[in-house]
Interface confidence: medium
């Protein structure tokens, strides 16, 4: 079952999944100037059996200027460098969730992939939060969120993490407090977590993969 809302936003924090539950989709997105090959997959899908999980489908990008040439999937070093790093910077890493049964590891990059990865999570997925550079964590509890099913609706649990500017606790003179993120959620929206969207995806994920809920084709 797909999680039909997004993990909660913590001001001045990012989140990262350490592994992805079976059923997770990852968009096959290409960087500017490139597009998916005509017959290529829209997404990769984490699938598996009781002993092994892996990503089905391969993402392939081709130059928007060319028609029939496909690019090899193995990324070149310079292209790997070009991708934004999505790894958490903290030395404090959670337990390697990728070793859990029913989970896929982070897929390797593909050539000319977009700079940001777009995942569609499923119930049971856990994501971990970390404060961005310039902010420090004040923990009241676990800095993680789990997508849960309650009374037929999905919701993400609230991570117990506050990210505070280092200036607020530091004694160093001349230190500037980092500017507040312009992307923070307005206060009126902080109680949205248990609210799910009106257009919930009720059907099984396998049955909805190629439907108009997710996909619109070029005319």
């Amino acid at each position: 079952e797909l999680c039909d809302d997004d993990p909660p936003e913590i001001p001045h924090a990012t989140f990262k999944a350490m592994a992805y539950k079976e059923g997770t989709m990852l968009n096959c997105e290409c960087k500017r100037g490139f597009r998916r090959i005509k017959s290529g997959s829209l997404y990769m899908l984490c699938t598996g059996n009781s002993s092994h999980s892996s990503w089905d489908n391969q993402c392939q990008c081709t130059s928007s200027a060319t028609r029939n040439t496909t690019k090899q999937v193995t990324p070149q070093p310079e292209e790997q460098k070009e991708r934004k790093t999505t790894e958490m910077q903290s030395p404090m890493q959670p337990v390697d969730q990728a070793s859990l049964p029913g989970h896929c590891r982070e897929p390797p990059p593909w050539e000319n992939e977009a700079t940001e990865r777009i995942y569609h999570f499923v119930v049971g997925q856990m994501v971990y939060y970390q404060c961005v550079q310039g902010y420090r964590a004040l923990h009241r509890g676990p800095a993680e969120s789990v997508c849960k099913m309650t009374h037929g609706k999905t919701r993400w649990t609230q991570p117990q993490l506050i990210c505070t500017g280092e200036m607020e606790t530091s004694q160093f003179p001349g230190e500037e407090k980092p500017q507040a993120s312009p992307e923070g959620r307005p206060e009126s929206e902080t109680s949205c977590l248990v609210t799910t969207t009106d257009f919930q995806i009720q059907t099984e994920m396998a049955a909805t993969m190629e439907t108009s809920i997710f996909t619109t084709e070029y005319q």
Epitope: K16, M25, Y119, H120
Partner: nanobody, 130 residues
Framework: EVQLVESGGGSVQAGGSLRLSCAAS?????????MAWFRQAPGKERDFVGS????????SYADSVKDRFTISRDNAKSTVYLQMNNTKPEDTAVYYC??????????????????????WGQGTQVTVSS
């Protein structure tokens, strides 16, 4: 990539209502995109009106339209809507639909700056007369 086409613009009396639609097309996963409405009055900057996260969980509005405008989306129809109630003459503008790519690792529920939106529609004119 996603292509956006607005519709529903027109003329309305002050205090009246109008509903704008923005249909998305393209070989893409529509629920990958956060959506927004902006507007541009003659001789002015293009201003943020409201935005909605990819599953409609989170919304944000400009102060000038709060409690009057409502943004919603229907992922099954690949469409985002702007319901304009209690319109005012100062709402007169070209209204643009915009989309940004959601990112699972570097995440923000709502974006309010036009530079953060990669995809734009052509706009639809709304005229509110007194």
């Amino acid at each position: 990539e996603v292509q956006l086409v607005e519709s529903g613009g027109g003329s309305v009396q002050a205090g009246g209502s109008l509903r704008l639609s923005c249909a998305a097309s393209g070989r893409t996963l529509y629920s990958s995109y956060g959506m927004a409405w902006f507007r541009q009055a003659p001789g002015k900057e293009r201003d943020f009106v409201g935005s909605i996260s990819r599953y409609g969980t989170y919304t944000s509005y400009a102060d000038s339209v709060k409690d009057r405008f409502t943004i919603s989306r229907d992922n099954a129809k690949s469409t985002v809507y702007l319901q304009m109630n209690n319109t005012k003459p100062e709402d007169t503008a070209v209204y643009y639909c915009a989309a940004y790519t959601y990112s699972g690792s570097f995440y923000s529920t709502v974006k309010t700056h036009r530079d953060e939106y990669q995809y734009w529609g052509q706009g639809t004119q709304v005229t509110v007369s007194s």
